[in-house]
């Protein structure tokens, strides 16, 4: 290389972290061999679960509000999952990403997309309830399955709006024992006249906005909205909180526990810049707490079944459906098709919050299971007896 | 070629002040970081100040802390150190040097040599 | 601040000989090091990088090695041209500090 070939300009700590060499240390080996395991677990699991959750909720449920903001949590855990696989890939061959610089932007953009996108979603749940119980009049009025559809559009168009700099600032850098990073680097697009100072600010920048937009704010919105529904429900002497209420804490919770590592190391690496002493507790910790907010992911399905027992019914009663199908004699599926029932339009009103965790009738056989094969996901239109009861005292 | 060409060497009386001057060419002098390194008369080699391409980030040993200060002027090419309150301490050959990337020295000076002494 | 210990000071050795110089931080300092070659009256000149990386134009009987906060700088078969002192260098937390450099002589 000539004297005057400027290489590729990488921040401190990125080049530092290239500099990281891999240890032969057999005991690291074993705890490799099992973040393989757990990583691959997680990602079957993950993909399962959120597949069967989009399922039974998309088609086998009764479309409400509350089942389509779980619909599209739902979806964004189902791409998050459907990225683990590859972050396994890359534990496997040794922490190398070995799938080119395109599908590292890609993959990296899925983990921050879901990210943005489980915040923002929450925000909106929590604010739904909000507004049902502070504004009811109103919720009644402007409460429709086709609002909140159009309302998560917006905000899958939010977020990834905001993954695009993690898009854009994502790269595959050679590390010098030959493994290759898939990782920031802040001074691939302008790097302005002084490098040091670039990367300072935008990693600081990075870390700080989706800290404030994928954690704080939606976190402060959902305290925030519990506290006005807290208050106005005390007034009206109500002390138990309903099914959805757990299941809304339960996915919160989650959420906070498995993002919350993941930014404070985030927002410690961006510090990191000015002190590198903080580097080795980053390079060290990032790496679990990524993966914890990965399972986040894989968490999810897991509390809406737990804290929802009709959803359990709703998923034992789908399952069976399936093996129905599989072992029935094609002789049976002549008139499959003519009954299957129309989706409820998608302009009508919710009746509770508590759609999700109630018991409409359902159709049985493998005639309902064609159907959804055939594209309509048909859900029974009838309100359950829970759903009823609780309609004006939902929370 | 890659040059660097110290000046601004001399002797000066202990409390003085001197400003050396690191001439660079053959390179893009503003992409890259520069530092300073000195050299006691048979001793070692001691770094002393370094300054990002842009010249908005600079650092120093608490040895040369609050007395010297690097800047450059990349329209000029060119890298200075200014020394102020000099001790005999401070005698050494002062060699300016480029930095690969975030690191580590690639070219260096001829060198100049700063003599504080009354 | 770290500290950098390089042991021999000095050594005597004939050409072809294999010669190994330590360099030891008080710290880990995570592969950021760097070996310099100074002869009497010149500037001193890289010879390697990232511990174990080995600068542009050096020979290939250099090799860098080593982790934490031990090093090595080894030339496989010294050669006349190599008689000079070494100093290690790291790169870890500023201020970045120099070995008290290793002279490597001719027996």
């Known amino acids: 290389m000539s004297a005057n070939a400027t290489l590729k300009p990488l921040c401190p700590i990125l080049e530092q972290m290239s500099r990281l060499q891999s240890h032969s240390n057999t005991s690291i080996r074993y705890i490799d061999h099992a973040a393989v395991l757990l990583h691959g677990l997680a990602s079957l699991l993950g993909l399962v679960e959120n597949g069967v959750i989009l399922f039974v909720v998309g088609c086998r449920m009764r479309q409400t509000v509350v089942t389509t903001w779980v619909l599209h949590l739902a979806l964004s855990d189902l791409l998050a999952s459907a990225s683990l696989p590859f972050f396994t890939y890359f534990l496997a061959v040794g922490h190398s990403w070995e799938l080119g610089t395109t599908f590292c932007k890609l993959h990296s953009s899925i983990f921050f997309l879901n990210m943005f996108a489980s915040g923002f979603l929450l925000s909106a749940i929590s604010l739904d309830r909000c507004l049902q119980v502070v504004r009811p009049v109103w919720a009644q009025n402007h409460r429709t399955v086709a609002a909140a559809h159009k309302v998560c559009l917006v905000l899958w168009a939010l977020a990834v709006l905001n993954t695009v700099p993690y898009f854009v600032f994502r790269d595959t850098i050679s590390r010098l024992d030959g493994r290759i990073m898939c990782y920031y680097n802040v001074l691939l697009l302008n790097p302005g006249p002084d490098r040091d100072a670039t990367c300072n600010s935008r990693q600081v920048a990075l870390a700080v906005s989706k800290f404030l937009l994928a954690f704080l704010v939606p976190l402060a919105i959902i305290a925030s909205s519990h506290a006005a529904v807290s208050l106005r429900l005390q007034h009206r002497g109500r002390r138990r909180p309903g099914r959805f209420v757990r299941l809304v804490a339960a996915v919160v919770a989650a959420f906070a526990l498995c993002w919350g590592p993941y930014h404070v190391f985030s927002l410690l690496e961006a510090r990191a810049h000015a002190n590198p002493g903080l580097r080795p507790l980053v390079w060290r910790g990032l790496p679990f707490v990524t993966s914890l907010a990965f399972f986040n992911s894989v968490a999810n399905p897991v509390l809406y079944v737990l804290t929802c027992p009709d959803m359990l019914r709703k998923l034992r009663r789908s399952l069976r459906t399936v093996l129905e199908s599989v072992l029935v004699d094609d002789s049976e599926l002549g008139g499959a098709g003519s009954s299957r029932r129309r989706r409820t339009s998608s302009t009508a009103r919710s009746a509770s919050p508590l759609a999700l965790c109630s018991r409409p009738e359902e159709p049985r056989g493998p005639a309902r299971l064609l159907g959804w094969l055939l594209g309509s996901c048909a859900a029974s239109p009838q309100t359950g007896p829970l759903n009823r009861a609780l309609s004006s005292t939902s929370s | 070629e890659v040059q660097l060409v110290e000046s601004g060497g001399g002797l000066v009386q202990p409390g003085g002040s001197l400003r050396l001057s690191c001439a660079a060419s053959g390179f893009t002098f503003s992409s890259y970081k520069m530092s300073w390194v000195r050299q006691a008369p048979g001793k070692g080699l001691e770094w002393v100040a370094v300054?990002?391409?842009?010249?908005?980030?600079?650092d120093y040993p608490g040895t040369v802390e609050g007395r010297f200060t690097i800047s450059r002027d990349n329209s000029k090419n060119t890298l200075y150190l200014q020394m102020n309150s000099l001790r005999a301490e401070d005698t050494a050959v002062y060699y300016c040097?480029?930095?690969?990337?975030?690191?580590?020295?690639?070219?260096w000076g001829q060198g100049t040599l700063v003599t504080v002494s009354s | 601040d770290i500290q950098m210990t390089q042991s021999p000071s000095s050594l005597s050795a004939s050409v072809g000989d294999r010669v190994t110089i330590t360099c030891r931080a008080s710290e880990n300092i995570y592969w950021n090091l760097a070996w310099y070659q100074q002869k009497p009256g010149k500037a001193p000149k890289l010879v390697v990088y990232a511990a174990t990386q080995l600068a542009d134009g050096v020979p290939s009987r250099f090799s860098g090695s080593g982790s934490g906060t031990d090093y090595t700088l080894t030339i496989s078969s010294l050669q006349p041209e190599d008689f000079a002192t070494y100093y290690c260098q790291h790169f870890w937390i500023t201020p970045w500090t120099f070995g008290q450099g290793t002279k490597v002589e001719i027996k």
């Open positions: 300054i990002s391409n842009g010249g908005s980030t600079t």
């Open positions: 040097a480029r930095h690969r990337t975030n690191w580590d020295f690639d070219y």
